[in-house]
């Protein structure tokens, strides 16, 4: 008799999830010599231990503490780049500007990027059929709690000037419900962080509006100012040129506004 299985609204665990996490862990230690002390088997055990045999709507930040401990990593606190709804460009940027880091450039973010996972209460099985959706099922699911946990720590580590890349093509350029808006903004430490600098990325080639005047950006400025952190904002009108100028800052065309 087939066992009854809870059907969730979201996609199931990414196929070959354990193998992917282990392979990414090994790859990360290859790219980052300072992390070669990392024991990838222990990392996988800690990752698995956070959600296996647990109800996928009842996951806590505490469940991820063993993994967080294993993935502890020093990042230059003044070189942090946050992003919201514009991951690909943020990652392209840090691939060029090697001294700046997004969460996905850190071990734990690198391991989990673009993956989905969940288990089932009281069984050691990984659920490859479906996982809880944040809106339709529950917010305390393994993936959401993971990103909340690591995003909070990442924001807490930041100092001096923190940069955030925002998508100017969205109706809400700053979204209070995004991870940036709901977690990272509130975990920047005013005693360490002097300024949050927003880079608003324009989508249309002919878009010359000052998106720093957008009401949602003003809302972000208000939240940040109330936390005793200064706020500044820049329009990135030409993201392609922006990346090109990061690669080749000496280029004569890079002195004009991008």
């Amino acid at each position: 008799v087939p066992r009854w299985r809870q059907q969730w609204s979201g996609p199931g665990t990414t196929k070959r999830f354990p193998e992917t996490v282990l392979a990414r862990c090994v790859k990360y230690t290859e790219i980052h010599p300072e992390m070669r002390h990392v024991d990838c088997q222990s990392v996988w055990d800690a990752f698995k231990g956070a959600f296996i045999s647990k109800h996928p709507c009842n996951i806590t930040e505490e469940d991820y503490q063993p993994l967080v401990k294993l993935g502890t990593q020093t990042v230059p606190c003044n070189k942090i780049l946050l992003w919201s709804r514009i991951k690909d460009l943020a990652h392209q940027f840090t691939q060029v500007q090697r001294d700046m880091f997004t969460l996905e450039d850190m071990l734990l973010g690198y391991l989990a990027d673009d993956l989905t996972w969940c288990g089932e209460f009281n069984t050691s099985k990984i659920n490859y059929q479906s996982c809880p959706d944040w809106r339709k099922d529950c917010s305390n699911n393994p993936v959401s709690v993971f990103w909340k946990t690591v995003s909070r720590r990442f924001a807490e580590a930041a100092c001096d000037v923190v940069h955030v890349m925002l998508n100017g093509s969205r109706s809400k350029i700053f979204d209070k419900n995004s991870t940036f808006g709901s977690v990272e903004v509130h975990n920047l430490q005013p005693e360490k962080v002097q300024t949050l600098e927003a880079w608003v990325i324009h989508g249309g080639r002919e878009d010359s509006r000052d998106l720093c005047q957008d009401p949602t950006i003003k809302e972000l400025e208000s939240i940040i100012s109330k936390r005793n952190i200064q706020f500044s904002c820049k329009n990135i009108y030409r993201p392609d040129k922006f990346l090109q100028c990061v690669k080749n800052p000496e280029d004569s065309s890079c002195t004009s506004e991008i």
């Epitope: 070669r36 002390h37 024991d39 990838c40 800690a46 294993l70």
Partner: antibody, heavy 121, light 107 residues
Amino acid sequence: QVTLKESGPTLVKPTQTLTLTCTFSGLSLSTSGKGVGWIRQPPGKALEWLAHIWWDDDKRYNPALKSRLTITKDTSKNQVVLTMTNMDPVDTATYYCARIELGRSYVMDYWGQGTLVTVSS
Amino acid sequence: DIQMTQSPSSLSASVGDRVTITCQASQDVITSVAWFQQKPGKAPKLLIYSASYRYTGVPSRFSGSGSGTDFTFTISSLQPEDIATYYCQQHYTIPLTFGQGTKLEIK
């Protein structure tokens, strides 16, 4: 089949420099993710890690001995060389080389048979 | 440096006995502990890594457990060929450090 073998002098005088060679087969340091380390064991005593080197020339040393140690590799000869300066009788020990592999932290899985080095005038 | 304190330093047991050796780390090493067997005049042999993973080809009578600072190595049924000195090692951080060893003898 991975094998490692240590070679070098059996006797060195105090203040001299010791040079040990680890020659290996079934393992290539031109392959990503591989490394070789050195460990020593004074007679009747515990093991002490000295240094290791990765395929990409990333090196790690025991801080207590760092000023005296140099680890290098010759990929074409399948060899790793450890030099230890200013030898003292307390450095008398069996010296082992061992393989390490990326992702396993610093777990040493294959070991050489060891070579006994005596420091005496 | 992380100190690895192993106990007992020596132990005598009979064939078929269950033998337990403990190792305490001076700070949290999560699960990054390996166990080695060394016979006289021979190189150490890896038995267990990452606290509880049996290395390839190691008999199932050998097992390891623990996390944080306290680790245990067990031989479920002692065999004559198990007579050796056993070492724990933390592979969590540099410098890698070993316990002082436990010499196992047959009664």
